[in-house]
């Protein structure tokens, strides 16, 4: 025997209390598939969340974050505070990257500068809190008579503060 509820389309629910007739989802609720026995409550985008897509009878609302925050998690389940470039978010708020680390985005953590010497390369441009070091050609690649500008001092080992 076919389940009578299977005939109920998205945007409706199969009403147990009314001989399994298909009733429309009430306001602030939705069913995105057919044959549902309940409509689900629409997500509400409040506080630091803002509505990216309104809820309809067949699809849930979608949220993003207000300016100064960015989405985290599946479907933007959380909003996390933005920091400036050169900072990372800690429990105590935005903090500058430690010496030897950088962050070139408004989110995420400070990452260690690239260690050019591991690839046998020299440091062409020193790293900052906002930018990674730029590695240049290996010293052996520098042809005789090339620019006599002294290359910048190598970056210190990543993650360590000055003594």
């Amino acid at each position: 025997l076919q389940d009578p509820c299977s005939n109920c389309p998205a945007g409706t629910f199969c009403d147990n209390n009314r001989n399994q007739i298909c009733s429309p989802c009430p306001p602030n609720s939705f069913s995105s598939a057919g044959g549902q026995r309940t409509c689900d409550i629409c997500r509400q985008c409040k506080g630091v969340f803002r509505t990216r897509k309104e809820c309809s009878s067949t699809s849930n609302a979608e949220c993003d974050c207000t300016p100064g925050f960015h989405c985290l998690g599946a479907g933007c389940s959380m909003c996390e505070q933005d920091c400036k470039q050169g900072q990372e978010l800690t429990k105590k708020g935005c903090k500058d990257c430690c010496f030897g680390t950088f962050n070139d985005q408004k989110r995420g953590i400070c990452r260690p500068w690239t260690n050019c010497s591991l690839d046998g390369k020299s440091v062409l441009v020193n790293g900052t809190k906002e930018r990674d070091v730029v590695c240049g050609p290996s010293p052996a690649d520098l042809s005789p008579g090339a620019s006599s500008v002294t290359p910048p001092a190598p970056a210190r080992e990543p993650g360590h503060s000055p003594q």
Partner: antibody, heavy 121, light 106 residues
Framework: QVQLVQSGAEVKKPGASVKVSCKAS????????MHWLRQAPGQGLEWIGY????????NYNQKFTDRATLTADTSTSTAYMELSSLRSEDTAVYYC??????????????WGQGTTVTVSS | EIVLTQSPDFQSATPKEKVTITCRAS?????IHWYQQKPGSSPKAWIS???NLASGVPSRFSGSGSGTSYTLTINRVEAEDAATYYC?????????FGQGTKLEIK
């Protein structure tokens, strides 16, 4: 008869997590939504969120979005509520309650017996 | 969120007296549900969708109201009605409850 049986009392330290279970019997588990609520000592009722066991869809009180996780195991007709980063203010009796989503009136017609969670260092 | 405010917080009544508990919403709601809770027990479904008595609830109880004002009335109160009563809404997320009205029978 329709019954919701919850797991036993828990004592936890601040910062820990707790997972409370709610075993349903006497009805078709996937036809109803399962809600979680709490009641602090001498206080009123506060809604945490709900899960639709049929689809796994969850909807949370925004106050609990980042700390509560609701799940359901349809093979055992059991719903679970996990609350993380516990603090002393989370000391309360936690209830599961069934709602006949089919009525779309979101009314809690059957309640579990409650699980006391105490958060203390 | 919609705030529900019950009045009074506490009511003392004598048997056979008429008791009225009010639940006011900060914004208009479609309907209100009521629950009864006795000390040490879980809440019990009492009245759904403003006026529908739950199974086993005595007919001396009734519910009414619309918009932002709802009432639970006990026509001739009895000793067994001593409990705390809560109203609840879901017209807007999240579900919210009133703070409760404690009814004492002298």
């Amino acid at each position: 008869q329709v019954q919701l049986v919850q797991s036993g009392a828990e004592v936890k330290k601040p910062g820990a997590s707790v997972k409370v279970s709610c075993k349903a019997s006497g009805y078709t588990f996937t036809f109803y939504t399962m809600h979680w609520l709490r009641q602090a000592p001498g206080q009123g009722l506060e809604w945490i969120g709900y899960i639709n066991p049929s689809s796994g869809y969850t909807n949370y009180n925004q106050k609990f979005t980042d700390r509560a996780t609701l799940t359901a195991d349809t093979s055992t007709s059991t719903a679970y509520m996990e609350l993380s980063s516990l603090r002393s203010e989370d000391t309360a009796v936690y209830y599961c309650a069934r709602s006949d989503g089919s009525s779309s009136k979101w009314y809690f017609d059957v309640w579990g017996q409650g699980t006391t969670v105490t958060v203390s260092s | 969120e919609i705030v529900l405010t019950q009045s009074p917080d506490f009511q003392s009544a004598t048997p056979k007296e008429k008791v009225t508990i009010t639940c006011r919403a900060s914004s208009s709601v479609s309907y209100i549900h009521w629950y009864q809770q006795k000390p040490g027990s879980s809440p019990k479904a009492w009245i759904s969708a403003t006026s529908n008595l739950a199974s086993g609830v005595p007919s001396r109880f009734s519910g009414s109201g619309s918009g932002t004002s709802y009432t639970l009335t006990i026509n001739r109160v009895e000793a067994e009605d001593a409990a705390t009563y809560y109203c609840q809404q879901w017209s807007s997320n999240p579900f919210t409850f009133g703070q409760g009205t404690k009814l004492e029978i002298k």
